[in-house]
């Protein structure tokens, strides 16, 4: 978790307001959830670690016509604006599980809130 | 209503230094990546720094050693420092929120004309 | 670099046709199924608006006569029907390779 700052060149993790946002916006999501997030998309499950926030960009990218998570898919690209380059990326996913959008972001909300708490954004 | 309002453009002569700064208001500053693009006097486009919202820095070898981009998330500015400018660097430069790659530079302030010359 | 080439040069469109405006890319800028190609409109005296992001995405405000196409290399940007509103030079911009490039532009004018 020493890089979450952007794994293209690793820096300061993010400010807390900017990691604060973040989980507000998820938390917006999964509480006004009525049908099934995306229609049920999937998309590639993620390590919680380094590179975090480029990995997450990566997966819920994938996700198309679906205006619940662009506002998220925006923010985490603050996160990580420019690409990664193609040696970094191909260790950013877990390629053998797909879960559903609702999922992964309860574990990403679940990860950031666990990050804040514990002060990680200095 | 998304706003960015540049300022400190000036006529600076080669080798000098300046400073560029960009006020942002009406989406939450400190969330999202930004950037300057300048544009030369023959109406080309040029990408000239990012910076993360996590204060990862990013620059083309043009100008990479010679600018500087920084933010203050509390009082919501965008800086541009440069040095040893040269004539090459004549633009009007534009502070942009950059929303990433996969999204581009959806808003842009009207720009701030910095100009090299002896 | 990146290099993008932008054809025509200028172009002009009698009111209530089509414009078509191309963008090559010197490499492909396609990144894991998204093409990170993004099109501007600048109208004399102001700053670059973005139309498209991602080749095809119409951006929020957007009127729907502006559409994107292309993958890898060869881009396209489109609009139909011309209206006197669209004078403008337009620009295509690649998010793939550092340092991110645009292309050269494409000055549209009314016939």
């Known amino acids: 978790l020493t890089c979450l700052g952007g794994f293209a060149s690793p820096g300061p993790v993010p400010p807390s307001t900017a990691l604060r946002e973040l989980i507000e916006e998820l938390v917006n999501i999964t509480q006004n959830q009525k049908a099934p997030l995306c229609n049920g998309s999937m998309v590639w499950s993620i390590n919680l670690t380094a590179g975090m926030y480029c990995a997450a960009l990566e997966s819920l990218i994938n996700v198309s016509g679906c205006s619940a998570i662009e506002k998220t898919q925006r923010m985490l690209s603050g996160f990580c604006p420019h690409k990664v380059s193609a040696g970094q990326f191909s260790s950013l996913h877990v390629r053998d599980t797909k879960i559903e959008v609702a999922q992964f972001v309860k574990d990403l909300l679940l990860h950031l809130k666990k990050l804040f708490r514990e002060g990680q954004f200095n | 209503e998304v706003k960015l309002v540049e300022s400190g453009g000036d006529l600076v002569k080669p080798g000098g230094s300046l400073k560029l700064s960009c006020a942002a208001s009406g989406f939450t500053f400190s969330s999202y990546a930004m950037s300057w693009v300048r544009q030369s006097p023959d109406k080309r486009l040029e990408w000239v720094a990012s910076i993360s919202s996590g204060d990862t820095t990013y620059y083309p070898d043009s100008v990479k050693g010679r600018f500087t981009i920084s933010r203050d998330n509390a009082r919501n500015i965008l800086y541009l420092q440069m040095t040893s400018l040269r004539s090459e660097d004549t633009a009007m430069y534009y502070c942009?929120?950059?929303?990433?790659?996969?999204?581009?530079?959806?808003?842009w302030g009207q720009g701030t004309l910095v100009t090299v010359s002896a | 670099d990146t290099v993008l080439t932008q054809s025509p040069a200028s172009l002009a469109v009698s009111l209530g046709q089509r414009a078509t405006i191309s963008c090559k890319a010197s490499e492909s800028v396609d990144h894991s199924g998204s093409s990170l190609m993004h099109w501007y409109q600048q109208k004399p005296g102001q700053s670059p608006k973005l139309l498209i992001y991602?080749?095809?995405n119409l951006e929020s405000g957007i009127p729907a006569r502006f559409s994107g196409s292309g993958s890898r290399t060869d881009f396209t940007l489109t609009i139909n029907p011309v209206e006197a509103d669209d004078v403008a030079t337009y620009y295509c911009q690649q998010s793939n390779e550092d340092p991110w490039t645009f292309g050269g532009g494409t000055k549209l004018e009314i016939k």
């Open positions: 991602r080749a095809s």
């Open positions: 942009a929120r950059l929303d990433g790659y996969y999204f581009g530079f959806p808003y």
